[in-house]
Interface confidence: medium
């Protein structure tokens, strides 16, 4: 299973649930479904209050038990390390794959943290991060922001990923804006 890591804003906007959590338990494989589940301890929720309703405590995250079908395998053994997890809700359960945005909270730039905490949501309604995978590429719409990080370096490590968000400038127009300049 291969996929290009998304811009964190795309991950935020396309996910049902975005949380901060620790992986605390030993993973278990369900012998019937061949899904494995990781026990987590949620410390913050950034998106998903409405989707979850009253069941606002997520205790497990589910993923296929094989990487060949995009199963996520958690490598860290540090149970106190916090991770940003952006996933989908299926039947009230949080599901992730290799293609989901899952990253140590400490590895995120301050700008990205600010994005997940409050800013990315502003761009979800109107704006689209549009990946530019090969030159030439052009904007399809005024509401698109061209994402060129992959042309230069790893998509997660690029300047646009780590420091910028695609936000409305005026109706029908979105531009890259610095997350540093946003109110903390």
């Amino acid at each position: 299973c291969t996929c290009v890591p998304p811009h964190p804003q795309t991950a935020f906007c396309n996910s049902d649930l975005v949380i901060r959590a620790k992986f605390v338990g030993t993973p278990e494989v369900n012998q019937t479904t061949l899904y494995q589940r990781y026990e987590i301890k949620m410390t913050k929720m950034y998106k998903g209050f409405q989707a979850l309703g009253d069941a606002a405590d997520i205790r497990f995250v589910y993923t296929p038990a094989m990487e060949s079908v995009c199963g996520y395998f958690h490598r860290s053994h540090n149970r106190s390390e916090e991770f940003l997890i952006a996933g989908k809700l299926q039947d009230g359960l949080l599901h992730i794959t290799t293609c989901s945005f899952v990253a140590p909270w400490n590895s995120l730039s301050l700008a990205q943290r600010r994005g997940f905490t409050k800013t990315y949501t502003v761009g979800c309604e109107e704006c689209t991060v549009f990946p530019c995978l090969s030159i030439p590429c052009k904007l399809q719409s005024g509401t698109h922001c061209l994402w060129t990080d992959q042309l230069l370096q790893g998509s997660e490590k690029g300047f646009q990923s780590r420091h910028l968000a695609c936000l409305p400038r005026e109706p029908g127009l979105c531009t890259w804006q610095s997350l540093r300049s946003q109110i903390a």
């Epitope: 030993t26 494989v29 012998q31 019937t32 479904t33 061949l34 038990a65 060949s68 395998f73």
Partner: antibody, heavy 116, light 108 residues
Framework: EVQLLESGGGLVQPGGSLRLSCAAS????????MSWVRQAPGKGLEWVSA????????YYADSVKGRFTISRDNSKNTLYLQMNSLRAEDTAVYYC?????????WGQGTLVTVSS | EIVLTQSPGTLSLSPGERATLSCRAS???????LAWYQQKPGQAPRLLIY???SRATGIPDRFSGSGSGTDFTLTISRLEPEDFAVYYC?????????FGQGTKVEIK
């Protein structure tokens, strides 16, 4: 007591087809993922395919993808492996095994020989 | 693709001796997805250890598993005559159900 009994093996020509069956008893069949594992004469074990309890998810080794199809009939407690476009290198004892990711019960195997 | 390499290929020991079998993965394997099997001639394999260190039902306590990451070990503390067989390690997940090539434990 868990029992798995394979059948359907035999001699087949290259390019031919064969359908293996595995009759299961002694456990709740529909709640267990099942797998096929094979062993060529004098060689080691090679996983072939797996299927979830409901039959909704199937998995294959690259060596058989597109040629073999795993299925199950939970009403008959039976696992199947349909093998098409058979090659000489498919010659092996085929075992059905209960569960995954580890295989806690195995059948005694059925020999498939692909030869002209 | 992940590869599991078992060593040694053959282990020649006497009953009562300690056997140490190694399984090395080409990349990190999830501990809960690693298992060991025993196979005797003409028989189906039998699950010995799952989750790298948990003994399967009915397996004597002379069998133990350990390890994490890329290095795993099966230890038989005192070999009994019925322990002479081929042993396979197996992982699930990175590439489905990959087996090692096996270690034969034979009577010296």
């Amino acid at each position: 007591e868990v029992q798995l009994l394979e059948s359907g093996g035999g001699l087949v020509q290259p390019g031919g087809s064969l359908r293996l069956s595995c009759a299961a008893s002694g456990f709740t069949f529909s709640s267990a993922a099942m797998s096929w594992v094979r062993q060529a004469p004098g060689k080691g074990l090679e996983w072939v395919s797996a299927i979830s309890g409901s039959g909704g998810s199937t998995y294959y080794a690259d060596s058989v993808k597109g040629r073999f199809t795993i299925s199950r009939d939970n009403s008959k407690n039976t696992l199947y492996l349909q093998m098409n476009s058979l090659r000489a290198e498919d010659t092996a004892v085929y075992y059905c095994a209960k569960s995954a990711p580890m295989f806690d019960y195995w059948g005694q195997g059925t020999l498939v020989t692909v030869s002209s | 693709e992940i590869v599991l390499t078992q060593s040694p290929g053959t282990l020649s020991l006497s009953p009562g001796e300690r056997a140490t079998l190694s399984c090395r993965a080409s990349q990190s394997v999830s501990t809960h997805l690693l298992a060991w099997y025993q196979q005797k001639p003409g028989q189906a394999p039998r699950l010995l250890i799952y989750g790298a260190s948990s003994r399967a039902t009915g397996i004597p306590d002379r069998f133990s598993g350990s390890g994490s990451g890329t290095d795993f070990t099966l230890t038989i503390s005192r070999l009994e005559p019925e322990d002479f067989a081929v042993y396979y390690c197996q992982q699930w997940g990175l590439t489905p159900a990959m087996f090692g090539q096996g270690t034969k434990v034979e009577i010296k």
